[in-house]
Interface confidence: low
C-alpha cells in the first residue's frame, strides 16, 4: 500500500545502558478521519482501558504493523522478522533496547472497510540511541514502586534530573490512556491504590533548528506493600513424624510462606541429618504455588525412590530463609506397622547397602 499519505511522527528513545527498559509505540491513528478505525477512545477517568486510540476494544485489535527498511526494500511484517518486538492490540512493544531498533514503523487497520481507510495509517520514525554518560547519576528508574496506602510519585526517567521549573511540558499515558491531569515531569499520588499500577509513558517535545521530536520513556509501576518484618513460616510438613512403608517411593513436600520483600531472595533447602553428619540434598527446583500481594507460598519436594531402613534413622530437615531470618522443620520417618512383607524388607536392605556405598563415595558431608 502507498504510505505517502500516512501521518508522520518522529520519536526518540534514549535508553539507559545501565538498566533493562522497554519502549512502546501507539498506533495513534489520525483524529480527523472519522472512519471505522480512526476514532480516539472516549473513556471516563475511572475506567482503565487496555490501549489507546480505538472506539470499541472488542472489535478492534486489528491493526497491522510494518517496518520500513532504510534501503527502500518492501515493508516487513513485524511479527515475522522481529521476535523482540511484540504487537499487542494497538501498541508495539520493544522488549530490548538497542540502536538496531532505529527505523520507520507503520501501522494501519488490518480490515479496510471503506475507501477512506486506505490513508488511515501512521508512520513513526524512531531514533534509538544510548543515553550519554554525562546524564545525571540519579535518573529515575524504568521500574518504579509505589507503597500502597502512602503518598508517592512517578517520575519521567528522561527528565528526572531536571527541576520541575526547568522541565518542558510532559504528556503522560497510563496503559495507553491519556492522563490529562498532569503536565509535569512527575505524577504525584496522594494515596496509592492498587489501580495506580501499570505501564506509564511520558512524552515531551524536543526541537532543534531542523525538526522536532517526541522524546519518550516507559515506566513500569507496581504497587506494593511494605517489606515483611517476619521470617518465613513453614506451612507443611506440620507433623514431625511421618508414617512410611519400607521399599516404597516417598515424596515429602515443604511449603513455606514468605512475606513480601521488594528485593526477594528466598532460600528453601532440604537437609538430611544422620548421626553427626549433615548434608544438603539435591532436590527438584522450588516452585511458587500461590502469590498474593503480601506473600508468596513456595514449595520444594524431596523425593526418595524407595524408603530404606537407614532412612528411618535419619532426620529430614526443611530449611527456609529470607532477609529477616530462617525457620526449619524436621521430619522423622516411622515405619507403618504391618505394612510390608519379608520381600519388601529384603529389597529395602539391598537398596540400603547400595545407598551406603553411594553416599560414602558421592556426598559432601559438613558438620
Amino acid at each position: 500500500f502507498n504510505i505517502s499519505g500516512c501521518s508522520t511522527k518522529k520519536l526518540l528513545w534514549a535508553y539507559s545502558t545501565r538498566s533493562e527498559e522497554e519502549f512502546i509505540l501507539f498506533c495513534d491513528l489520525p483524529e480527523p478521519q472519522k472512519s471505522h478505525f480512526c476514532h480516539r477512545s472516549q473513556l471516563s477517568p475511572t475506567q482503565v482501558p487496555d490501549h489507546l486510540p480505538f472506539t470499541d476494544s472488542k472489535d478492534l485489535p486489528d491493526v497491522q504493523w510494518y517496518r520500513q527498511p532504510s534501503n527502500g526494500d518492501p515493508l516487513e511484517d513485524i511479527r515475522k522478522s522481529y521476535p523482540h518486538i511484540i504487537q499487542d492490540k494497538c501498541t508495539l512493544r520493544f522488549l530490548t533496547p538497542g540502536v538496531n531498533n532505529t527505523g520507520s514503523y507503520i501501522c494501519r487497520p488490518k480490515m479496510i472497510k471503506s475507501p477512506y481507510d486506505v490513508a488511515c495509517c501512521v508512520k513513526m520514525i524512531l531514533e534509538v540511541k544510548p543515553q550519554s554518560n554525562a546524564s545525571c547519576e540519579n535518573s529515575a528508574s524504568h521500574k518504579q514502586d509505589l507503597l500502597l496506602g502512602s503518598t508517592g510519585s512517578i517520575s519521567c526517567p528522561s527528565l528526572s534530573c531536571q527541576s520541575d521549573a526547568q522541565s518542558p511540558e510532559v504528556t503522560w499515558y497510563k496503559n495507553g490512556k491519556l492522563l490529562s491531569m498532569t503536565r509535569s515531569n512527575r505524577i504525584v499520588v496522594d494515596e496509592v491504590y492498587i489501580y495506580h499500577q501499570g505501564t506509564y509513558v511520558c512524552d515531551y517535545t524536543q526541537s532543534d533548528t531542523a525538526s522536532s521530536w517526541t522524546v519518550r520513556a516507559v515506566v513500569q509501576v507496581r504497587t506494593i506493600v511494605g517489606d515483611t518484618k517476619l521470617k518465613p513460616d513453614i506451612l507443611d510438613p506440620v507433623e514431625s513424624t511421618l508414617e512410611v512403608e519400607l521399599g516404597k517411593p516417598l515424596t515429602i513436600s515443604c511449603k513455606a510462606r514468605f512475606g513480601f520483600e521488594r528485593v526477594f531472595n528466598p532460600v528453601m533447602k532440604w537437609y538430611i541429618k544422620d548421626a553427626d553428619l549433615e548434608w544438603e540434598v539435591s532436590v527438584p527446583e522450588a516452585k511458587s504455588i500461590k502469590s498474593t500481594l503480601k506473600d508468596e507460598i513456595i514449595e520444594r519436594n524431596i523425593i526418595l525412590e524407595k524408603v530404606t531402613q537407614r532412612d528411618l534413622r535419619r532426620t529430614f530437615v526443611c530449611f527456609v530463609q529470607n532477609s529477616i531470618g530462617n525457620t526449619t522443620q524436621s521430619v522423622q520417618l516411622k515405619e507403618k506397622r504391618g505394612s510390608g512383607g519379608l520381600n519388601d524388607i529384603f529389597e529395602a536392605q539391598k537398596i540400603e547397602w547400595h545407598e551406603t556405598v553411594r553416599f560414602q563415595s558421592h556426598h559432601h558431608h559438613h558438620h
Epitope: 482503565v48 487496555d50 498474593t292 500481594l293
Partner: antibody, heavy 123, light 107 residues
C-alpha cells in the same frame, strides 16, 4: 484458618443508624482490604464498600452519603454504620476479606466471607 | 457503574449435565471477573477469579473463560451439590458490581 463473624442488632427502626461489627479470627487484619456486601431478601448482592488495614476507604456511590466503615486493628475488627435507614435497607449483611492475587497484574478476590447477619428495618 | 447481566436467570438441569452460564459486562473489564456460588442461607463462595483461575479447593468441573465483555462459567458435569445460585462480579472499576444471579435447579 481465617474466619469472619458479623454481629449487631437484627432489628433497626426507620431513620435510625444500623451498626454492625465484623470480628476477624484466626488471622491478622493487616495487609488486606475488608468489605461489606448486602443482599436484600430474594435479591442479588450489592457491594457497600471497603476499608484497608491502614484505614483508607472506598464506598459505593449509591450509599456513600450514609455509609461509614471503620477499623480497629487492636481488636481485629471492622465496622459498618449506615445512617437514615429505610425498609429498603432490610437485607442480609456480609463482611468479607479482599485478597490481592498477583498473576502478572494484580486481581482482587473476595476469598473469605462471614456467614451473614439479617437486619430488618421496621418500626 | 459497570452493569453485569447474567443469562439465563434460572435453569433446570440433571445430574451429569453440562451447564453454561454467561455474564455480559456493559463495558470492557479485561479479565477482572470472579464467579461465586451461593446456597440458600449461606454466604457466597468464591469459585473462579481473574475470569479463569480456580480458587484453591474448587473442583475442576468448574471452569471460567472470557475477556473484555463476555464471560462464561461452565460446569462440565453437574453434581448434586452444585444446585445453587451463581453470581459473577467485576473487579475492574469501582464500585464493584455483581450480576443478578443464575439459579441452577434440579430438573
Amino acid at each position: 484458618q481465617v474466619q469472619l463473624q458479623e454481629s449487631g442488632p437484627g432489628l433497626v427502626k426507620p431513620s435510625e443508624t444500623l451498626s454492625l461489627t465484623c470480628t476477624v479470627s484466626g488471622g491478622s487484619i493487616s495487609n488486606y482490604y475488608w468489605t461489606w456486601i448486602r443482599q436484600p431478601p430474594g435479591k442479588g448482592l450489592e457491594w457497600i464498600g471497603y476499608i484497608s488495614d491502614s484505614g483508607s476507604t472506598n464506598y459505593n456511590p449509591s450509599l456513600k452519603s450514609r455509609v461509614t466503615i471503620s477499623v480497629d486493628t487492636s481488636k481485629n475488627q471492622f465496622s459498618l454504620k449506615l445512617s437514615s435507614v429505610t425498609a429498603a435497607d432490610t437485607a442480609v449483611y456480609y463482611c468479607a476479606r479482599e485478597t490481592i492475587v498477583v498473576r502478572g497484574f494484580y486481581f482482587y478476590v473476595m476469598d473469605v466471607w462471614g456467614q451473614g447477619t439479617t437486619v430488618t428495618v421496621s418500626s | 457503574a459497570i452493569q453485569l447481566t447474567q443469562s439465563p436467570s434460572s435453569l433446570s438441569a440433571s445430574v451429569g449435565d453440562r451447564v453454561t452460564i454467561t455474564c455480559r459486562a456493559s463495558q470492557g473489564i479485561s479479565s477482572a471477573l470472579a464467579w461465586y456460588q451461593q446456597k440458600p442461607g449461606k454466604a457466597p463462595k468464591l469459585l473462579i477469579y481473574d475470569a479463569s483461575n480456580w480458587e484453591s479447593g474448587v473442583p475442576s468441573r468448574f471452569s471460567g473463560s472470557g475477556s473484555g465483555t463476555d464471560f462464561t462459567l461452565t460446569i462440565s458435569s453437574l453434581q448434586p451439590e452444585d444446585f445453587a445460585t451463581y453470581y459473577c462480579q467485576q473487579f475492574n472499576s469501582y464500585p464493584w458490581t455483581f450480576g443478578q444471579g443464575t439459579k441452577v435447579e434440579i430438573k
